[in-house]
């Protein structure tokens, strides 16, 4: 059933989430900047076809439109999306020594955000079943594919975070 912004989410949780989204967006932007500066991979739209062939998935947030927001479904999709991106970032490991530290921080920040969401769902008695394993993750056959994958994963993650931020900001409105 749809639940509006006046639902049972504590303001402290929503503000923490907004903070975390902004932190991850900064990490993601740093990764994109380094991929652009180091490898001249600056335009994710030019890599869309490669993204399809590599099988890089998108995370849906269909339960989160502000007009008919389903709280449990939306939080669950947020968590599932973050879980997906943890796997995608893991698949990028070894992308390059220059990008390693930025990718490492991004990976941990995404994991911490997933924890925050799950913690709140648990407190509301709506925690989803634990996902035992990741789905099939893209396999990168070359250094170029991994770097191109990095551009696409960072771009997809930023889009996911932009939607997440709008949803959370809507929920945080009194």
């Amino acid at each position: 059933t749809p639940l509006g912004p006046a639902s049972s989410l504590p303001q402290s949780f929503l503000l923490k989430c907004l903070e975390q989204v902004r932190k991850i967006q900064g990490d993601g932007a740093a990764l994109q900047e380094k991929l652009c500066a180091t490898y001249k991979l600056c335009h994710p739209e030019e890599l869309v076809l490669l993204g399809h062939s590599l099988g890089i998935p998108w995370a849906p947030l269909s339960s989160c439109p502000s007009q008919a927001l389903q709280l449990a479904g939306c939080l669950s999709q947020l968590h599932s999306g973050l879980f997906l991106y943890q796997g995608l970032l893991q698949a990028l490991e070894g992308i390059s020594p220059e990008l390693g530290p930025t990718l490492d921080t991004l990976q941990l920040d995404v994991a911490d955000f997933a924890t925050t969401i799950w913690q709140q769902m648990e407190e509301l008695g709506m925690a989803p079943a634990l996902q035992p394993t990741q789905g099939a993750m893209p396999a990168f056959a070359s250094a170029f594919q991994r770097r191109a994958g990095g551009v696409l994963v960072a771009s997809h993650l930023q889009s996911f975070l932009e939607v997440s931020y709008r949803v959370l900001r809507h929920l945080a409105q009194p």
């Epitope: 923490k16 932190k23 900064g26 879980f83 943890q86 530290p101 941990l108 994991a111 924890t115 925050t116």
Partner: antibody
Framework: QVQLVQSGAEVKKPGASVKVSCKAS????????MHWVRQAPGQGLEWMGY????????NYNQKFRDRVTITADTSTSTAYMELSSLRSEDTAVYYC????????????WGQGTLVTVSS | DIVMTQSPLSLPVTPGEPASISCRSS???????????LYWYLQKPGQSPQLLIY???NLASGVPDRFSGSGSGTDFTLKISRVEAEDVGVYYC?????????FGQGTKLEIK
């Protein structure tokens, strides 16, 4: 309540390996990252790395990357830190600490495990 | 890696008197989201560290309000308004802006 209980003290010879365990209770283990921090005698704290048990992903401080392995067993809610090619400078108390964001980061620590490396 | 530098390394204090510990980071810990990723931990003798202050100025649960944290992007201060005997131990600042997380060398607070 959240508890992190670590394995007992170890004495090892140089060149050997040690595996320290950290059993978690009072929360849903796979959801939180678990970090390892060490403290040499009379020294400060040093972050070694962490594991994300939900996906089995571990990340390490570059200083230890070739010698440390962090794992987790979600069926027993236990994290492990294995350090190989031990040298005398590895004599330290090793702590596990639960990760998280904001007021959750390192809000819970294990009691520490003293590892002594001596010939 | 971000280097965290504390001063003083030793701090003898009379009970009831204030105390102040400084910490400096080699890089700004102020993120564009407005949060400063600086933490303070206290390790009492024979114990594991405990969280005192998170994100530069927020008191952790159960920490007495005689403790406070402040600072800018690179310079931070932990203040104790009136030191009590139970405050003895080693105080560490730490950053979690980026990996690897790093700690200061520690400041040992002792009672005069």
């Amino acid at each position: 309540q959240v508890q992190l209980v670590q394995s007992g003290a170890e004495v090892k010879k140089p060149g050997a390996s040690v595996k320290v365990s950290c059993k978690a209770s009072g929360y849903t283990f796979p959801i939180y990252t678990m970090h390892w921090v060490r403290q040499a005698p009379g020294q400060g704290l040093e972050w070694m790395g962490y594991i994300n048990p939900s996906i089995g992903y571990a990340n390490y401080n570059q200083k230890f990357r070739d010698r440390v392995t962090i794992t987790a067993d979600t069926s027993t809610s236990t994290a492990y830190m294995e350090l190989s090619s031990l040298r005398s400078e590895d004599t330290a108390v090793y702590y596990c600490a639960r990760g998280g964001y904001g007021d959750s980061l390192f809000a819970y620590w294990g009691q520490g495990t003293l590892v002594t490396v001596s010939s | 890696d971000i280097v965290m530098t504390q001063s003083p390394l030793s701090l003898p204090v009379t009970p009831g008197e204030p105390a102040s510990i400084s910490c400096r980071s080699s890089k700004s810990l102020l993120h564009s989201n407005g949060i400063t990723y600086l933490y303070w931990y206290l390790q009492k003798p024979g114990q594991s560290p405990q969280l005192l202050i998170y994100q530069m100025s927020n008191l952790a649960s159960g920490v007495p309000d005689r403790f406070s944290g402040s600072g800018s992007g690179t310079d931070f201060t932990l203040k104790i308004s009136r030191v009590e005997a139970e405050d003895v131990g080693v105080y560490y600042c730490a950053q979690n802006l980026e990996l690897p997380y790093t700690f200061g060398q520690g400041t040992k607070l002792e009672i005069k």
